[in-house]
């Protein structure tokens, strides 16, 4: 058993049918010694008397808010949450496995640049009685500071019969140098509580591996005289790290017909312009990627050929 | 990525082309190592990230773009002095800091070159003959060092009398390749920045 926050305790349990459970001793936070009784949640049934209460915690029915009283007055509370260990693995019932890039990916994180700012998000099918708290650091043995905001509900989607809820959080490394070579990963820890169930999720990454630039901006077409060709030009996204000559991007230019089945013409370039043939009803799209470290491509920025 | 490769202009900053080749070569070598050593801890998540140049060179600090020198998090008090007469500096007026930067890059390359050659000698003794260092990568390191053209003491190749532990050598190869790839990215960024300056 350990304290999650004031008066909230997590009981770690080997979780299988008929498991023996854990013996927990609760102590009433009071100078009083006599006449103390204990109750659980809203029930008025007295579970025991005395300054301490010993309980065998085996299932969710044994968790909840234990209260000690004296003569009708509440003395203190202890909220017991359960953390299930199924066959030696901590349970992951609250969050949905996003399975990208691999199984057991519950947290996904992205950064738009090398400033040390990043966003993480996760999914759940649970809509009520749910709280999250997020902590982060650079490294774990001698952790350096990363400040995270509060997790917020960022999207709701309908998936088949189920509603899916996306939560996200923004974090900022306290003293980040965009040019630094990372040797210690960023660690992100999310505590999730649903009713009386506690779970924790972690992710470990280097900012360089979660970079996903914003799409190129100001995408423009300039027809070339007496030709079906057009000059496509664009600019680096505002959110990308500067100077651009140091934090360079590479670009992929794609000409896509109206039908998805039509052949796509693709050109790769390090410049911020390219000459392509514009077909009728086609569209031109450009996306960006760090020129030197192949993390994710940005989403496409698109303009119609007409 | 199989992208069309731009040929450098004759008047281009001479080291840019070599640094691009370096990054391509180390990335290919790392990919080959990951595939060949699939049952070894060789991914970024599995290895310890060690920098063999730590406390010996200060490439990131010495090569910091001017725009980032205002960022206190980027300024490190480590000062290392280097020899300052490189041919990449030819045909341009360069500051002391730029010379320091390029000589720091040269020292990095020299240290990695020694480590890789020592490691390759061990890998050649492996009865499994599972993996060797790409000669192209070693040649590209050499070319960039020649282009930088710093006069520096030759570091003797380390020789070891004890029987090599091939498992450990292969794990060390992965660690070294990951670190060298990160440094090659920094070198490429620096060359691109200097070329635009």
């Amino acid at each position: 058993i350990w304290e999650l926050k004031k008066d909230v305790y997590v009981v770690e349990l080997d979780w299988y049918p008929d498991a023996p459970g854990e013996m927990v001793v609760l102590t009433c936070d009071t100078p009083e010694e006599d006449g103390i009784t204990w109750t659980l949640d809203q029930s008025s049934e007295v579970l025991g008397s005395g300054k301490t209460l010993t309980i065998q915690v085996k299932e969710f029915g044994d968790a909840g808010q234990y209260t000690c009283h004296k003569g009708g007055e509440v003395l203190s509370h202890s909220l017991l949450l359960l953390h299930k260990k199924e066959d030696g693995i901590w349970s992951t019932d609250i969050l949905k496995d996003q399975k990208e890039p691999k199984n057991k990916t519950f947290l996904r994180c992205e950064a738009k640049n090398y400033s040390g700012r990043f966003t993480c998000w996760w999914l759940t099918t649970i809509s009520t009685d749910l709280t999250f708290s997020v902590k982060s650091s650079r490294g774990s043995s001698d952790p350096q500071g990363v400040t995270c905001g509060a997790a917020t509900l960022s999207a709701e989607r309908v998936r088949g019969d189920n509603k899916e809820y996306e939560y996200s959080v923004e974090c900022q490394e306290d003293s980040a140098c965009p040019a630094a070579e990372e040797s210690l990963p960023i660690e992100v820890m999310v505590d999730a509580v649903h009713k009386l169930k506690y779970e924790n999720y972690t992710s470990s990454f280097f900012i360089r591996d979660i970079i996903k630039p914003d799409p190129p901006k100001n995408l423009q077409l300039k027809p070339l005289k007496n030709s079906r060709q057009v000059e496509v030009s664009w600019e680096y996204p505002d959110t990308w790290s500067t100077p651009h000559s140091y934090f360079s991007l590479t670009f992929c230019v794609q000409v896509q017909g109206k039908s998805k089945r039509e052949k796509k013409d693709r050109v790769f370039t390090d410049k911020t312009s390219a000459t392509v043939i514009c077909r009728k009803n086609a569209s031109i799209s450009v996306r960006a990627q760090d020129r030197y470290y192949s993390s994710s491509w940005s989403e496409w920025a698109s303009v119609p050929c007409s | 990525r199989n992208l069309p490769v731009a040929t450098p202009d004759p008047g281009m900053f001479p080291c840019l082309h070599h640094s691009q080749n370096l990054l391509r070569a180390v990335s290919n070598m790392l990919q080959k190592a990951r595939q060949t050593l699939e049952f070894y801890p060789c991914t970024s998540e599995e290895i310890d990230h060690e920098d063999i140049t730590k406390d010996k060179t200060s490439t990131v600090e010495a090569c910091l773009p001017l725009e980032l020198t205002k960022n206190e998090s980027c300024l490190n008090s480590r000062e290392t002095s280097f020899i300052t007469n490189g041919s990449c500096l030819a045909s341009r007026k360069t500051s002391f800091m730029m010379a320091l930067c390029l000589s720091s890059i040269y020292e990095d390359l020299k240290m990695y070159q020694v480590e890789f050659k020592t490691m390759n000698a061990k890998l050649l003794m492996d009865p499994k003959r599972q993996i060797f260092l790409d000669q192209n990568m070693l040649a590209v390191i050499d070319e960039l060092m020649q282009a930088l053209n710093f006069n520096s003491e030759t570091v003797p190749q380390k020789s070891s009398l004890e029987e090599p532990d091939f498992y450990k050598t292969k794990i060390k190869l992965c660690i070294l390749l990951h670190a060298f790839r990160i440094r090659a990215v920094t070198i490429d960024r620096v060359m691109s920045y200097l070329n635009a300056s």
Partner: antibody, heavy 112, light 107 residues
Framework: EVQLVESGGGLVQPGGSLRLSCAAS????????MVWVRQAPGKGLEWVAS????????YYADTVKGRFTISRDNAKNTLYLQMNSLRAEDTAVYYC?????WGQGTLVTVSS | DIQMTQSPSSLSASVGDRVTITCKAS??????VAWYQQKPGKAPKGLIY???HRYSGVPSRFSGSGSGTDFTLTISSLQPEDFATYYC?????????FGGGTKVEIK
């Protein structure tokens, strides 16, 4: 007493479908993840699919992905395995399990 | 996929013998290994989880050890009711995979 009882097995033609059920009792079913494991005649054990307590996380073996669907009804204390496009190699005894307890198994025979 | 290689595939032993069965994972699985016992015509039953933890009600003569890639199930003093087939399983990553089984027969 913990009990897991499978039903729904039988003889089916290749390409056909079956729905297996597993009735759970003696424990709080809704608090536990569950799995289906199969055993071909005279062979070893093969994991088929897993489902978390609230159905939010589901995993399948590659051999059954796209053909089988694991689901549960916590109100009915029942685990299901919907099997479509059945093949001869799916012939096996199918067990539902929540360690350390396994059901007695139900035999599925796919044959023309 | 992670392969679990169990050995021996069968063994003959007498009541009172100490029996050791090994299981080798093709890659590191931490301690996420379970052991099962299956008697002819019956369903398997869990004995050990997390490589070395006995489920409640499992006799103390059964013990498990190991971590990483090498795991062992030991029966300290074989009893008549222990003649069965034993399987190891890794649950470190999907797909979950079982060893081929070890049949423990009466000598």
């Amino acid at each position: 007493e913990v009990q897991l009882v499978e039903s729904g097995g039988g003889l089916v033609q290749p390409g056909g479908s079956l729905r297996l059920s597993c009735a759970a009792s003696g424990f709080t079913f809704s608090d536990y993840g569950m799995v289906w494991v199969r055993q071909a005649p005279g062979k070893g054990l093969e994991w088929v699919a897993s489902i978390s307590s609230g159905s939010s996380n589901i995993y399948y073996a590659d051999t059954v992905k796209g053909r089988f669907t694991i689901s549960r009804d916590n109100a009915k204390n029942t685990l299901y395995l919907q099997m479509n496009s059945l093949r001869a190699e799916d012939t096996a005894v199918y067990y539902c399990a929540r360690n350390p307890y396994w059901g007695q198994g139900t035999l599925v025979t796919v044959s023309s | 996929d992670i392969q679990m290689t169990q050995s021996p595939s069968s063994l003959s032993a007498s009541v009172g013998d100490r029996v050791t069965i090994t299981c080798k994972a093709s890659q590191n699985v931490g301690t996420n290994v379970a052991w099962y016992q299956q008697k002819p015509g019956k369903a398997p039953k869990g004995l050990i989880y997390s490589a070395s933890h006995r489920y409640s009600g499992v006799p103390s003569r059964f013990s498990g050890s190991g971590s990483g890639t090498d795991f062992t199930l030991t029966i300290s003093s074989l009893q008549p009711e222990d003649f069965a087939t034993y399987y190891c399983q890794q649950y470190n990553s999907y797909p979950l995979t079982f060893g081929g089984g070890t049949k423990v027969e009466i000598k």
